[in-house]
């Protein structure tokens, strides 16, 4: 029995063909018989040589399923058929090509296509009567519409399209259509007429024109002064660079790809030349002035201002200021001088006529009458005169004539006319300099002299009548010079609060009591006059030590005796006891601790009267002695 051909398969599918592959069977055979079914149901048979292992079925219908049988034959014997089923590829198809919105210079194409993944669509647009005018467009495969602009007016076109899917082209779809006739321009008007420019406005259908062509003629000379082409989207244009007070004819044409509309015209007269007006001078000062002027609201490039001395035409200064200004400050002029001020404007390269005015500057500001008053030992007052409303500040310089290098400077508001100068030393000669400062000037300096008064005398501070509990303070002072005196008493160790005594200006001494015995005190005396306090006078003293009291002798023998005493209230370091026979001889001395109040005197001579003296000691200070006498047995 013949064996079946092996591994029958479809290796390639296309829209109108199928490629078959198989392997040769093992048994001997003469030929192959290939049968395949048509969509109509009938079968087609093909005989193939025995060495064939592939075959292409051609002329098939796209998108159809085919049954294929392959049999090996030997004589009248047939093998069992090998079978395979396969479908041809679908033909991607475009449909419903429509041309919409066939405007006068463009077309809109729409088409439908199955949902295959199209890579591109290729469109050709050509004039129906001129195949050489073909335009090709390639658009992305996701589009189903395309705009074709830039066509001729009222012209028949043939539009063709195909898609590209899986790298292959679909069949071509075509349609015929015509573009519309040219639209008309609407009306043309003129707005914002100036002396050298105007604005032209017009109406026209949207998207109708590629450009507009504008021609400007001078009516009197019929000369073309401007030719202008503007984009078709504009409906307004500024026409600059015209002459003032001149009549113009302006013509507008719409231009398409290959066609121009009938012109629309308008006649217009430009304005007269611009003028400056209302030149005035405000705020005249001694060194400057402010110039004001008026103009129409045109865009001036700048203004040129000339300022010259009326009596000296060579001394002219020119000033260029921005065209947006209507006033300018002119500084740096001479005081009390007549000037001629002129101005003209520059606009679009044109100079307006010049305007002029005459003006005189004010006199230079002055200061004077520098006076000194209310002199005291430490201060004085100054007053002066000055031109009002000019000065920002006055500078006062005070020089001590004894120390010329040391100067004090005071800056005072320009509104002031007086100054109080304080903190000066008494009995001193000063030179005072005054100058005024304005924005562009420092006046000449004026000067005067002043001498501070002498301070009244306070001197000869003395301390007397020192005792253990106080002392007397006295001093000398100028008569009727002082309102009061201040006496301050401070202990040297600064352990106690200072004591202050205020005395009338007539007093010259003060008795101090109730002080502590045997300590140092500092005394300060200062005088007050017209609220000023003098430098204090200073003196130091120590209150006297307290003396021992009530000497008593007891336990007297031939050669000894005991002496007792009462200690002073203030603590002392030691007591010194001196004893000597009344008849004379060398005194004997005993020193005992300050806490003791008795001692034994020894080595005495029998039957002799002794004089005994006791003093208290503290540091180098010694008290007044206390004395007594006794006679040995």
């Amino acid at each position: 029995e013949l064996d079946t051909p092996k591994d029958l398969q479809v290796s390639e599918t296309a829209e109108t063909s199928l490629t078959l592959l198989w392997k040769t069977p093992l048994a001997k055979f003469d030929r192959y018989r290939l049968n395949y079914s048509l969509p109509t149901g009938q079968w087609v048979g093909v005989q193939l040589p025995r060495n064939t292992t592939s075959y292409v079925l051609r002329g098939l219908e796209p998108g159809q399923e085919y049954n294929v049988l392959l049999t090996a034959e030997k004589g009248r014997h047939k093998s069992k058929p090998a079978r395979v089923k396969a479908s041809t590829e679908e033909v991607p198809s475009l449909e419903n090509l429509t041309v919409t919105e066939a405007g006068w210079d463009g077309l809109r194409l729409n088409w439908t296509a199955d949902d295959l993944a199209y890579e591109y669509f290729v469109i050709q647009v050509q004039e129906a009567n001129n195949v050489e005018t073909a335009h090709n467009f390639t658009v992305p495969g996701n589009l189903r519409a395309a705009d074709i602009p830039g066509l001729k007016v009222a012209t028949s076109y043939r539009v063709s399209i195909y898609g590209v899917a899986r790298g292959y082209r679909t069949p071509v779809l075509s349609a015929e259509t015509s573009t519309g006739t040219t639209p008309n321009l609407g009306e043309v008007t003129v707005a914002e007429v100036g002396w050298d420019a105007l604005t032209l406005n017009w109406t026209a259908p949207e998207g109708a024109y590629k450009n507009f062509f504008i021609q400007v003629l001078e009516a009197d000379t019929t000369q073309t002064v401007q030719n202008l082409t503007v984009p078709g989207g504009l409906r307004s244009v500024d026409l600059p660079g015209l002459k003032a007070a001149t009549r113009y004819y302006i013509t507008l044409r719409g231009v398409t790809q290959d066609f121009g509309t009938a012109p629309l015209s308008v006649e217009v007269l430009t304005e007269d030349l611009p003028q400056l007006g209302g030149l005035s001078v405000t705020e005249v000062s001694w060194d400057g002035l402010t110039l004001n002027w008026t103009t129409d609201d045109l865009a001036y490039k700048h203004f040129v201002v000339q300022v010259q001395e009326a009596n000296n035409v060579e001394a002219a200064q020119n000033l260029t200021v921005p065209g947006s200004l209507r006033a300018v400050d002119i500084p740096g002029l001479k005081a009390d001088t007549p000037y001629r001020v002129s101005i003209y404007g520059v606009i679009q390269g044109y100079r307006t006529p010049m305007l002029s005015t005459d003006v005189s500057t004010a006199r230079e500001p002055e200061i004077g009458n520098l006076n000194v008053s209310d002199v005291t030992p430490k201060s004085f007052n100054l007053s002066w005169t000055a031109t009002d409303g000019i000065f920002d500040m006055f500078t006062i310089e005070i020089i001590d004539s004894n120390r010329l290098l040391q100067t004090a400077e005071h800056n005072i508001s320009g509104a002031e006319r007086t100054a109080h100068i304080s903190g000066l030393p008494p009995s001193t000669d000063f030179i005072v300099y005054l100058s005024g400062i304005a924005p562009s000037i420092r006046t000449k300096t004026i000067s005067t002299t002043a001498t501070t008064e002498a301070l009244p005398l306070l001197e000869n501070l003395t301390i007397s009548d020192t005792n253990p509990y106080g002392f007397t303070v006295s001093w000398t002072a100028s008569e009727n010079a002082f309102d009061s005196f201040l006496v301050t008493v401070v202990d040297s160790g600064k352990l106690l609060d200072p004591q202050e005594f205020t005395l009338s200006g007539t007093q010259r001494k003060l008795e101090l009591r109730g002080l502590i015995t045997g300590i140092g005190y500092e005394v300060l005396v200062s005088g007050f006059t017209q609220g000023h306090q003098t430098k204090p006078l200073r003196a130091e003293t120590i209150t006297a030590m307290g003396s021992p009291k009530e000497v008593i002798f007891s336990d007297i023998t031939e050669n000894s005796a005991t002496v007792s005493w009462r200690a002073p209230t203030a603590q002392v370091e030691s007591f010194r006891i001196t004893y000597v026979p009344i008849t004379g001889g060398t005194p004997s001395m005993v020193t005992v601790d300050g806490t003791k109040t008795q001692t034994r005197l020894v080595k005495l001579i029998p039957g002799v009267e002794y004089l005994v003296s006791i003093i208290a000691m503290k540091g180098f200070e010694e008290s007044e002695p206390v004395s007594g006498s006794f006679t040995t047995a």
């Epitope: 829209e15 292409v56 290729v122 090709n136 467009f137 390639t138 992305p140 082209r169 069949p171 071509v172």
Partner: antibody
């Protein structure tokens, strides 16, 4: 009138690459397809591949897939064909050509001779 | 890829003869076919596109026909300038496609 001007002749070693340029003038370069065709000495025409500059995507013949790269620069209206791994059988005249709507190649460059020799 | 087979590969003819060259596609390509003429040392020249449309400037003695898989180029009256090699090319492939192997028309 479209004109296509190609770069000059090249002599290359086997295994190397060659890049041929094609500058277009006188038409809307980006909207039409540019194809590259070669012709070996005494042989027929062989379509290698093509590109639509507006999209920058290229299609290649199966035989050259992986060895040829076709690019385009819209700003200079220039297409390029680069062939790599050259062998002696790549010795040929290489043409660029513009495709019309139906795919017919209606304008051709003057041709660039590429010789591959060790 | 679609294969294109041209016949004959060489054709001898005389001036004034009617000449026919055929081209077969390995699968249907509808009418996506172009014919070219090439002379030695020159670039090819497009004669026919879309199987039967005559390219601008090409003499009317050249015509094309066919669709699907079978196509014909006919030169109605061979002229001395027509001795050259002729190629068919399928354009079903986008943006262009495979050529036939060529038919050389020589003087008999």
């Amino acid at each position: 009138q479209v004109q296509l001007v190609q770069s000059g002749a090249e002599v290359k070693k086997p295994g190397s690459s060659v890049k041929v340029s094609c500058k277009a003038s006188g038409g809307t370069f980006s909207s039409y397809a540019i194809s590259w065709v070669r012709q070996a000495p005494g042989q027929g025409l062989e379509w290698m591949g093509g590109i639509i500059p507006i999209f920058g995507t290229a299609n290649y013949a199966q035989k050259f897939q992986g060895r040829v790269t076709i690019t385009a620069d819209k700003s200079t209206s220039t297409a390029y064909m680069e062939l790599s791994s050259l062998r002696s059988e790549d010795t040929a005249v290489y043409y660029c050509a513009k495709g019309n709507f139906y795919g017919g190649l209606d304008y051709w460059g003057q041709g660039t001779t590429v010789t591959v020799s060790s | 890829d679609i294969q294109m087979t041209q016949s004959p590969s060489t054709l001898s003819a005389s001036v004034g003869d009617r000449v026919t060259i055929t081209c077969r596609a390995s699968q249907s390509i509808s009418s996506w076919l172009a014919w070219y003429q090439q002379k030695p040392g020159k670039a090819p020249k497009l004669l026919i596109y879309d199987a039967s449309s005559l390219e601008s400037g090409v003499p009317s003695r050249f015509s094309g026909s066919g669709s699907g898989t079978e196509f014909t180029l006919t030169i109605s009256s061979l002229q001395p300038d027509d001795f050259a090699t002729y190629y068919c090319q399928q354009n079903k492939k986008f943006p262009s496609g495979t050529f036939g192997q060529g038919t050389k028309v020589e003087i008999k």
